[in-house]
Interface confidence: medium
């Protein structure tokens, strides 16, 4: 199916930035993988390069305001040809769940005190209001609540005096129309405006002001135009050569306003002065490798020695990663394809241990499915041998880190029954619907 | 051990509207998602319909979309298909399939097959024109 692409994909936003155009297959537009398309407009955007997996969205906000509840977030697999880790296609959505709590109390409505006194008119003439008051201790609210109502009321007084009304001028009229719209008539135009006293009105019992300045006012037309032209579009111009050598480009033809050119005010000509096209030069653009991961440490050995596991003998170990990815004459992936350290080995030796904190509570599993729990560990954690933390293996290449490596056998005195792991669980609260944002939006 | 068995298939006439179930024992119907897919004589298998473990949300094929309804009823362990404006090109075996990861969601996820642990054996629907 044709889609809509794009040149360039926003990794912060997730959105698709400047379009080249569309009717154009997903396997053209990702000749360049650092095109990105859309199936529809306003719809998903996927970025040509390999699939990986976004950012994860900001916490959605808690399901509850006050207590405990819980709130979701969630991250997209976005890429087009193969898979996010977990064999997870484009387009899926993975999602956490927590737990949360706003507010620990939940608000408590107060009470009205009773009325207090009536304040004086709020005029000394004519009708106005007064007030009184009332305060919200009777009792107090709690935990941000309120009391039910209003805090004043109000109602009508009459002073039983008129009031003088003062003249106020109502807005200008517009202006007269000049006699000529072009310059060069035979009179010079001029223009004139008018204002009425009667907003409102002085009274004459009691007597009111009346309204300062004059009632009209007149000026010349100054800068009346010459007449316009309107200006016409010139032929369209060559096409301009296709500006990439990669993937899908876009050329562009221009044509000038100047058949002819508008003058004295007169109108530009309309439409566009330029209009582009879409190139295809059927070359796929160069790919650059990238680091896989690390691989595992390789166990720690030493030369010559059939184990130093429990000893105090440092070894050496290695790990190696991929460049994968390269292609089409790309850049090859930089920095070292090997890393080597100093070790000593642990792996399967007896340590003495003890019992960690607790951990902080994990996250509430599963995040979409029913009954999400979370739950919080206490391991029995080894207590490492104090051997020197640097060594010097080759005379005069100074001294070396020397990491502790392999999976011991930690013993601690039994807690709960347990000898490695305590665990505890809870259920998650008010658990919120994983949906997806892009459906929400139509 | 773990039984998903479908029913309601038969031959229709073309624009005629037929209703397949799909009945789940041996596993916690309530925690999964479930799927209808099809497959047509010497075609691959298609995706249809899908339809989350709560049921608030629904997926359909855009070949199947506004005619067909799915839907489940977590009390009686299982899932429906509603077919109406039946045409020709709708025959095919259906099969109904069960999702247990509840960490994933989106069309993109649902309508790839691998993705489900448990498949019925299918029901025959044929239309007539």
């Known amino acids: 199916d044709p889609v809509l692409c794009f040149t360039q994909y926003e990794e912060s936003s997730g959105k698709c930035k400047g379009l080249l155009g569309g009717g154009v297959s997903v396997e053209d537009c990702c000749l360049n993988t650092a095109f990105a398309y859309q199936k529809r407009s306003g719809g998903l955007c996927q970025p040509c390069r390999s699939p990986r997996w976004s950012l994860w969205s900001t916490w959605a906000p808690c399901s509850v305001t006050c207590s405990e509840g819980s709130q979701l977030r969630y991250r997209r697999c976005v890429g087009w040809n193969g898979q996010c880790s977990g064999k997870v296609a484009p387009g899926t959505l993975e999602w956490q769940l927590q737990a949360c709590e706003d507010q620990q109390c939940c608000p408590e409505m107060g009470g009205w005190s009773g009325w207090g006194p009536w304040e004086p008119c709020s005029v000394t003439c004519s009708k106005g209001t007064r007030t009184r008051r009332r305060a919200c201790n009777h009792p107090a609210p709690k935990c941000g609540g309120h009391c039910p109502g209003q805090a004043q009321e109000s109602e009508a007084c009459d002073t039983q005096q008129v009031c003088p009304t003062h003249g106020a001028w109502a807005t200008w009229g517009p202006w007269t129309p000049c006699s000529a719209s072009c310059h060069g008539g035979p009179h010079e135009p001029k223009e004139t405006r008018s204002r009425k006293c009667s907003a409102p009105e002085p009274s004459q019992k009691p007597p009111g002001k009346p309204c300062p300045g004059l009632a009209y006012e007149q000026r010349r037309c100054t800068g009346l135009p010459p007449c316009p032209v309107a200006g016409g579009w010139g032929p369209w111009g060559p096409v301009s050569p296709c500006p990439v050598t990669c993937g899908l480009g876009q050329t562009m033809e221009q044509r000038t306003c100047n058949h002819p050119v508008p003058q004295h005010g007169g109108p530009f000509c309309a439409g566009d002065a330029t209009r582009t096209h879409i190139c295809n030069t059927a070359v796929p653009c160069p790919v650059d490798g990238e680091w896989d991961s690390w691989g595992e440490w390789s166990p720690c050995i030493r030369r010559n020695m059939k184990s130093i596991s429990c000893q105090e003998i440092p070894g050496q170990q290695s790990r190696g990663r991929t460049c994968r990815g390269r292609k089409f004459d790309g850049h090859r992936c930089a920095g070292q394809q090997q890393d080597i350290r100093h070790c000593y080995s642990i792996q399967h030796c007896p340590l003495k241990g003890s019992w960690s904190e607790w951990s902080t509570w994990g996250l509430c599993m599963p995040p979409c499915g029913p009954n999400p729990t979370r739950a919080r560990q206490r391991l029995c954690t080894p207590l490492l041998p104090k051997y020197p933390p640097t060594v010097s293996m080759v005379e005069g290449q100074g001294e070396k880190n020397v990491t502790f490596w392999g999976r011991p056998l930690p013993r601690c005195e039994e807690l709960q029954g347990q000898k490695l792991v305590v665990e505890e669980k809870r259920p998650c609260l008010h658990v919120p619907a994983c949906k997806d944002p892009e459906e929400e939006e139509l | 051990q773990v039984q998903l068995v479908e029913s309601g298939g038969g031959l229709v006439q073309a624009g005629d509207s037929l209703r397949l179930s799909c009945a789940a024992s041996?596993?916690?119907?309530?925690?999964?998602?479930m799927g209808w897919f099809r497959q047509a004589p010497g075609k691959e298998r298609e995706f249809v319909a899908a339809i989350t473990w709560s049921g608030v949300s629904t997926y359909y094929a855009d070949s199947v979309k506004g005619r067909f309804t799915i839907s489940r009823d977590n009390a009686k362990n299982r899932v429906y298909l509603q077919m109406n404006s039946l045409k020709p090109e709708d025959t095919a075996v259906y099969s109904c399939?069960?999702?247990?990861?509840?960490?994933?969601?989106?069309?993109?996820?649902?309508?790839?097959?691998?993705?489900?642990?448990?498949w019925g054996q299918g029901t025959q629907v044929t239309v007539s024109s």
């Open positions: 399939a069960a999702d247990g990861s509840g960490r994933y969601s989106g069309m993109e996820y649902y309508n790839r097959d691998w993705v489900y642990d448990y």
């Open positions: 041996g596993f916690t119907f309530s925690s999964y998602a």
